[in-house]
């Protein structure tokens, strides 16, 4: 099949899927599109993973390119290393495979670069400008387990149709990620829908065992049951619904209590009414009607901004008066011109080489903006209570299979995401020390629950999703805005969620987040034009829920390829890099632990509500903070505070000064 047909296609193994999206996108747009589907740009770190990518891409045209998840900041060349100074978007440089098109050549690496894979031939890696919209991109979706494809049964009317959590529909999968739906049509009746779920005894499996189309009692029409038919001991048939659904009055069909959209923002099955409503970060339930959400006015909190504060729907921004500029903490103001100098000092003089010519001096801010910053955020807690988020996955997405990107404008990610499905790489980083910035104030111990590794798939209903509060360390808890649950009582102290401090962004050199330099926007514009966040611009958080009605997908069926691969042990003291370089096809490079230096910490610029970068959850066991590509830059006068998901107790200022109708692109990171 031609991978350049209109529809995406995928190939799944027992622990991850790759998907090819033939959509013209810049690197940032591609990264966002993968993130919004719960994945990441592809990171083929081993020869086995690369083989799966090869099988998926096939023999495409030489003129076409696909983004993969590799990027490098300006002047970050490390030509002696396998990735040459490039970093995976998952935040690390570990690899056991490379496929560069050319041998490394010396050079100053003056500009930021991203990597695209050739669609033809050997699928070599090429580097180039990140702002070019290449022909497509490869996403990778990791998960804890997968269900094998169903065996065809004699009574089936056709092959099972599978819908994955990342919206691909096909009859051709060999492995189905946790959370996938299988729709089986039977000759004698309406058939059955199954969900790939977590099994009580461990592992994952289909929500019901076969045979699906044969047998007495529940045959031939599933006993008239919409979901599950149970043959009781006395011979009569009773119907049951999968988790999150309730049996309708007719005793046969199942209804989703959230299907009628009773909640303004987020709905979750369960509770006395069959559902409970929740509000996103920056909103709280209306006192007169818990189904509605009203904006939390953070500007009413004393000291939230040093000078001026503007509240808008779903968030707030700090401003400074004329002659002052916003500091990197997004709160404080300093006399204009003071910040840049201090920022340079913080970075170290090595970034600004006095010996460089005019061109290099012009790029000093690029070097500054191109550093790495820890993206702090949400800790996902131990399984103690039902989650405080609606599980927004529906098995059939006729209109949503393509990531909803208003191209060429960057997307509007959700303000807060449920935990991402962890991506378990077969290559574990054992080399990078965690260096905590010594300048961040220590928060009270009650605000720092233990880090629980995100090893459960995102659908697991026993995941605790915390109530997130924008906690300012110097304020009493009564002033802390956050997501409020209508249906759950306050948590006891033992399960107190982590508090997000918007005041002290934390710098972890080991966990890297991309940076972008400043954007040219007049301060007068930013202080008078404050676009509110549109409520419906962001797609639903793609988490997986067992409560959705299993149904035959109505989306077009895609052909896929699947390759079963051996599971590689995840603890390796060192990595061997196999390279498909045309110069040395069998080249093996040993990467000792000592060769992984931490990157320089860098202050984090701000970002406006017109172009928010998705908050992200851990997707990789050895780097809890993925890279966040950015095409826009910061303004010293503007900052938007949003939480991001990383295993720390402090959030990050994600802000930029581009206006809604004037979004600039750049070759650099946030």
């Amino acid at each position: 099949q031609d991978p350049w047909a209109a529809e995406p296609r995928s190939a799944c193994g027992p622990s991850s899927c790759y998907a090819l999206f033939p959509r013209r996108r810049t690197f940032l747009e591609a990264w966002r599109a993968c993130r919004e589907l719960g994945g990441d740009l592809a990171t083929p770190r081993t020869p086995e993973e690369a083989q799966r990518v090869d099988n998926l891409v096939g023999a495409g045209p030489a003129s076409r390119l696909l983004w993969i998840g590799l990027q490098r900041q300006a002047r970050q060349c490390q030509l002696q290393r396998p990735l040459r100074g490039f970093t995976w978007t998952t935040g690390d440089q570990d690899t056991a495979f490379t496929n560069w098109a050319q041998p490394a050549t010396g050079g100053p690496c003056p500009a930021q670069r991203c990597v695209a894979l050739e669609a033809s031939g050997e699928h070599r890696w090429l580097e180039g400008s990140c702002t070019l919209a290449v022909d497509g991109y490869l996403c990778q979706f990791g998960f804890e387990g997968a269900c094998p494809a169903l065996q065809d049964e004699a009574g089936q009317a056709g092959p099972a149709v599978y819908t994955t959590p990342f919206h691909l529909v096909s009859t051709e999968f060999e492995w189905l990620p946790f959370g996938s739906v299988a729709a089986v049509q039977c000759q004698a009746g309406r058939g059955a829908s199954l969900l790939c779920v977590k099994q009580p005894e461990g592992g994952v499996g289909w929500s019901r065992a076969g045979p699906l189309c044969l047998g007495a009692g529940c045959s031939p029409d599933n006993g008239g049951c919409e979901h599950e038919c149970v043959e009781e001991v006395d011979g009569h048939v009773s119907c049951r619904c999968t988790e999150g659904f309730r049996l309708a009055a007719d005793g046969r069909s199942c209804e989703d209590p959230c299907a009628q959209a009773p909640c303004e923002q987020q709905c979750e099955p369960g509770g006395p009414q069959g559902y409970s409503c929740h509000c996103r970060l920056g909103f709280r339930p209306a006192e007169d009607d818990p189904h509605r959400c009203v904006d939390t006015d953070e500007c009413q909190i004393a000291g939230v901004c040093q000078q001026m504060c503007v509240n808008y729907v779903g968030g707030f921004e700090c401003y400074c008066s004329e002659g002052h500029e916003l500091e990197a903490d997004g709160i404080s103001c300093s006399p204009a011109g003071a910040m840049g100098a201090r920022a340079s000092q913080d970075l170290g003089d090595e970034l600004l080489d006095d010996g460089e010519d005019e061109e290099d001096e012009d790029e000093a801010w690029e070097a500054f903006g191109g550093g790495w910053t820890e993206m702090p955020g949400i800790l996902w807690m131990e399984p103690t209570q039902p989650p405080d988020f609606a599980l927004a996955y529906r098995p059939s997405f006729p209109e949503d299979r393509e990531p909803q990107i208003p191209y060429p404008e960057p997307t509007w990610p959700p303000p807060l995401s449920a935990p991402r499905v962890p991506y378990h790489s077969s290559v574990l980083s054992v080399t990078r020390p965690v260096v905590v910035s010594a300048t961040r104030p220590t928060l009270p111990s009650a605000h720092q629950p233990p880090v629980i590794p995100a090893t459960h798939p995102a659908l697991s209903r026993d995941h605790q999703i915390p109530v997130i509060a924008a906690n300012y360390p110097d304020l009493p808890s009564a002033y802390q805005p956050g997501i409020l649950s209508v249906s759950h009582p306050a948590q006891p102290p033992a399960h107190q969620p982590p508090m997000i401090s918007t005041r002290y962004p934390e710098l972890f050199p080991a966990h890297q987040s991309p940076m972008f330099p400043d954007t040219q926007v007049a301060g007068t514009q930013t202080t008078t034009h404050l676009p509110a966040i549109p409520p419906n611009r962001a797609p639903l958080v793609t988490t997986l829920g067992a409560h959705q009605p299993p149904q035959a997908p109505d989306a077009p069926v895609l052909r896929t390829q699947a390759t079963q691969l051996p599971i590689i042990p995840t603890a390796q003291p060192s990595l061997t890099t196999s390279s498909r370089s045309p110069v040395s096809p069998a080249h093996q490079v040993s990467v000792p632990a000592a060769t992984q230096p931490p990157a320089l910490p860098t202050l984090l610029p701000s970002q406006s509500p017109t172009n928010q970068t998705s908050p992200i959850s851990p997707t990789h066991p050895h780097s809890k903070v993925p890279q966040i590509p950015r095409e826009d830059g910061p303004s010293p006068k503007l900052a938007l505070w949003l939480p991001s998901a990383a295993p720390t107790a402090a959030p990050t200022a994600l802000g930029e000064a581009s206006l809604a109708e004037h979004i600039q692109r750049d070759d650099r990171w946030l």
Partner: antibody, heavy 124, light 108 residues
Framework: QVQLVQSGPEVKKPGASVKLSCKAS????????IHWVKQAPGQRLEWMGY????????TYNQKFKGQVTITVDTSASTAYMELNSLRSEDTAVYYC?????????????????WGQGTLVTVSS | DIQLTQSPSFLSASVGDRVTITCRAS??????VAWYQQKPGKAPKLLIY???NRYTGVPSRFSGSGSGTEFTLTISSMQPEDLATYFC??????????FGQGTKLEIK
């Protein structure tokens, strides 16, 4: 070596049509996108549109949409551009150019080879 | 559309001179900029791609620099055969290429 050879000069009356050709040699024709660029006297170069010979995918500059049609004959390794409803302001040199895919391990979308150009004169 | 403005439009230089041509973009184009040389009656030839990479076979006296909105083509030592018009081109919003108006380089 790579070559793009364009058809000869044309003189047309207003309202007429003209079809220009661009024959490629020295490389695999379906591996590279072909662009067409206009250079009117005293004016800057203007991108008109492209075709990918691999799958006939075309995209046009909004300014020329409706007036221009780009096609290929892969068996002849030739790209064509037809200009309809000619006006005096269509008097220009028209170039076909190949978009590069990669240079020395870099991908890039600059135009690495150009035809010699075809002068089209529109005059009553 | 992204506009490119070259300066100067005309330039006279002597053999051996260092020549600098500037190209400004109306908005950020990253490094998606190329430079072309066009001799009278001929087709343009690619000199520099991706803002700073010299194309195969181009003499080392030609160099490019810049990123974002400001780009420079430099001829370190002007030669008689460099008499030509030089164009910058951006392609960050590919396939919508735009070109600068050109800089005509003459020999003094």
């Amino acid at each position: 070596q790579v070559q793009l050879v364009q058809s000869g000069p044309e003189v047309k009356k207003p309202g007429a049509s003209v079809k220009l050709s661009c024959k490629a040699s020295g490389y695999t024709f379906t591996d590279y996108v072909i662009h067409w660029v206009k250079q009117a006297p005293g004016q800057r170069l203007e991108w008109m549109g492209y075709i990918n010979p691999y799958d006939d995918d075309t995209t046009y500059n909004q300014k020329f949409k409706g007036q221009v049609t780009i096609t290929v004959d892969t068996s002849a390794s030739t790209a064509y551009m037809e200009l309809n409803s000619l006006r005096s302001e269509d008097t220009a040199v028209y170039y076909c150019a190949r978009r590069g895919n990669s240079y020395d391990g870099y991908f890039d979308y600059s135009m690495d080879y150009w035809g010699q150009g075809t002068l089209v004169t529109v005059s009553s | 559309d992204i506009q490119l403005t070259q300066s100067p439009s005309f330039l006279s230089a002597s053999v051996g001179d260092r020549v600098t041509i500037t190209c400004r973009a109306s908005q950020n184009v990253g490094t998606a900029v190329a430079w072309y040389q066009q001799k009278p009656g001929k087709a343009p030839k690619l000199l520099i791609y991706s803002a700073s990479n010299r194309y195969t076979g181009v003499p080392s006296r030609f160099s490019g620099s810049g990123s974002g909105t400001e780009f420079t083509l430099t001829i370190s030592s002007m030669q008689p055969e460099d008499l030509a018009t030089y164009f910058c081109q951006q392609y960050t919003n590919y396939p919508m290429y735009t070109f600068g108006q050109g800089t005509k380089l003459e020999i003094k």
